[in-house]
């Protein structure tokens, strides 16, 4: 997760847009990835690379467990 | 309306440091980045850098050398700009700006004049 | 660091006719075909008033003599028809990224 991450922030060279999407990192199990962008006010770009960064990680981490539970099986 | 009002004149020697204020208004004061500006006498537009006040994010011209802070304190709507160790080339106006979009500076301040002199 | 090239440094001008000033980047400031530079027009004692954002988008109040264009690393500010208020200093200026770099300016008189 960490390594796609980094890869993703590192095309965005403003360091506002490059938080905004470590931001969307975070997890938050009571919203989605578009209800917490849509609170953002600071410009699209921010919304943007928020959005990209929350649903690559909500995805890996979605395939991660799905993984664990086949393991489990 | 927007506005962003700037503190007066100053005039401080060298070695000493500068604080300039920015008291932001006709906005939601958290919403948009501000930036710091300078221009020398006869010379053109400097970036020192900028803070999102919602989150505190800063980041600074690497030409201050560590020399620049910038703060907020969103209870009264002002940003703040710290120079220190003043040197005499360090004379100039000193501007605040309110970014849109993460784009373009569509609001400046008057601009404060510092002075720097033995 | 991004440096932005301003040209010419200082121009003359008569009343009617067309200003053109370029503004080079030393590298693309195209993000997925957004164009982060913008023009700001500056007359002495007062701070910088923004022109045109986006290369070529002209801000509200902004009289349509003045125009952008230009993308990737060229762009263009063009005055036409000057008129004598727009003797003042231009600046171009670019928020691709970190550090926010300023072009040297371009001092327009009119004749």
């Known amino acids: 997760l960490q390594e796609k991450i980094e890869e993703i922030a590192a095309k965005y060279k403003h360091l506002v847009v490059k938080k905004c999407c470590y931001d969307g990192v975070r997890i938050n199990h009571d919203e989605t990835c578009e209800q917490r962008a849509a609170r953002i006010s600071v410009g699209p770009r921010c919304v943007k690379a928020f959005t990209e960064c929350c649903v690559v990680a909500s995805q890996l981490r979605a395939n991660n467990s799905h993984k664990d539970l086949q393991l489990g099986r | 309306q927007v506005q962003l009002v700037q503190s007066g004149a100053e005039v401080k020697k060298p070695g000493s440091s500068v604080k300039v204020s920015c008291k932001a208004s006709?906005?939601?004061?958290?919403?948009?980045?501000i930036h710091w500006m300078r221009q020398a006498p006869g010379q053109g537009l400097e970036w020192m850098g900028y803070i999102y006040p919602r989150e505190g994010w800063t980041n600074y011209n690497e030409n201050f050398k560590g020399r620049v802070t910038i703060t907020a304190d969103k209870s009264t709507s002002t940003a703040y700009m710290e120079l220190s160790s003043l040197r005499s080339e360090d004379t100039a106006v000193y501007y605040c700006a309110r970014e849109r979009n993460l784009e373009y500076f569509d609001y400046w301040g008057q601009g404060t004049t510092v002075t720097v002199s033995s | 660091d991004i440096v932005l090239t301003q040209s010419p440094a200082s121009l003359a001008v008569s009343p009617g006719q067309r200003a053109t000033i370029t503004c080079k980047a030393s590298?693309?400031?195209?993000?997925?075909?957004?164009?982060?530079m913008n023009w700001y027009q500056q007359k002495p004692g007062q701070p910088p008033k923004l022109l045109i954002y986006?290369?070529?988008n002209l801000d509200s109040g902004v009289p349509a003599r003045f125009s952008g264009s230009g993308s990737g690393t060229d762009f263009t500010l063009t005055i036409n028809p000057v008129e004598a208020e727009d003797t003042a200093n231009y600046y171009c200026q670019q928020s691709n990224e970190d550090p926010y770099t300023f072009g040297g300016g371009t001092k327009v008189e009119i004749k």
């Open positions: 986006a290369a070529s």
């Open positions: 006709g906005y939601t004061f958290t919403d948009h980045i």
């Open positions: 590298q693309s400031v195209d993000y997925e075909g957004f164009n982060y």
